[in-house]
């Protein structure tokens, strides 16, 4: 029997025996199109597909709709995997979403959603979340019910303003809402009282811009 050489996500990579963190080539569901993703094979049992990472401000996250659709950055550093791939993947089966956060004081926290998926591009990659647990706030910092995705050239928020232009970055903005993990990266001692930083309100409050963030997904039945 021929060995499987295409993987849909990092959980399949892990189950095939590749248990080392790193960049792996994944294949779009029902397609031969490929995408490179970082796989975390250690945290919480491994098999996590990293869909977003911020850590040093080296990558500009004020990008277009198309760039957020296909992804940008470097999977070994700061990057966005791509809304189209994540949408297709999370509509194939049930996925969980884990968001890992670091502040500038050495603290870490996470939010875990037991069910996560993105609608199609026709529905503006609207985010759907259920079942929040974790240490980064008892209330979801991603507004519920989920909002459409917005970018600087694709304004789908509920604000009289254009949240993506005002806060920078593409995100599931409300008006504008309690979070934006794709905001401007601010260094230590310049990270408070920021109107457009990397925000997760129900952990660090208003105006606090985080040091590092990772968004990762894995099948619920892993």
């Amino acid at each position: 029997k021929e060995e499987q050489i295409s993987f849909r996500d990092c959980a399949e990579v892990f189950k095939s025996g590749h248990t080392t963190n790193g960049i792996y080539t994944l294949t779009f569901p029902n397609s031969t199109e490929e995408i490179k993703a970082y796989c975390d094979m250690e945290a919480g049992g491994g098999g996590w597909t990293i869909i977003q990472r911020r850590e040093d401000g080296s990558v500009d996250f004020q990008r277009t709709w198309k760039e957020y659709k296909v992804g940008f950055g470097n999977p070994s550093g700061e990057y966005w995997l791509g809304n189209e791939f994540v949408s297709q993947l999370t509509n194939q089966q049930r996925y969980v979403l884990k968001i890992h956060l670091k502040d500038w004081e050495g603290n870490e926290a996470y939010s875990l959603y037991e069910h996560f998926y993105l609608s199609s591009e026709e529905l503006n990659y609207r985010i759907h979340l259920k079942g929040l647990t974790g240490t980064a706030g008892k209330i979801s910092s991603i507004s519920q019910p989920g909002n459409d995705f917005s970018t600087k050239d694709g304004d789908n928020d509920k604000c009289i303003c254009k949240c993506s232009q005002m806060l920078t970055g593409g995100w599931w903005f409300d008006a504008c809402g309690p979070s934006n993990l794709n905001g401007m990266y601010y260094p230590q001692r310049q990270n408070t009282n920021k109107f457009n930083g990397i925000k997760w309100y129900y952990w660090k409050g208003s105006g606090y811009s985080l040091k590092a963030t990772t968004m990762m997904i894995r099948p619920a039945d892993f």
Partner: nanobody
């Protein structure tokens, strides 16, 4: 850098008055709304009053309507909260905070707490005889 500095707090007898000031720097009031919030020991932070300098719109919580007046002096980049007929239940640390004025949901007039991204350190108001 964005900074908000409150002043004017202190000890006052019931029925007395105080005027709090919120001096803003790093941005101009024209493009922002300023809110006054308060937090009493063991209680949640609550909105008291807010102003959008550009349109002159104001907001007051029911508990302070008719007693508190918010105003702004854009030339000084300062917002004031005139507090009259003070009651013991007004005792709290008072904070001012800023939000870009345009960050408004369609059909709404004011902003949820999490939209205020810049905060001062607070000034203590104690109402006691």
């Amino acid at each position: 850098d964005v900074q908000l500095v409150e002043s004017g707090g202190g000890l006052v007898q019931p029925g007395g008055s105080l005027r709090l000031s919120c001096a803003a720097s790093g941005f101009t009031l024209d493009d922002y709304a300023i809110g006054w919030f308060r937090q009493a020991p063991g209680k949640e932070r609550e909105g008291v009053s807010a102003i959008r300098s550009s349109g002159g719109s104001t907001y007051y919580a029911d508990s302070v309507k008719g007693r508190f007046t918010i105003s702004s002096d854009n030339s000084k980049n300062t917002v004031y909260l005139q507090m009259n007929s003070l009651r013991p239940e007004d005792t709290a640390v008072y904070y001012c905070a800023a939000v870009p004025a345009g960050r408004l949901r369609f059909g709404e007039q004011w902003y949820p707490l999490y939209e205020y991204d810049a905060w001062g350190q607070g000034t203590l108001v104690t109402v006691s005889s």
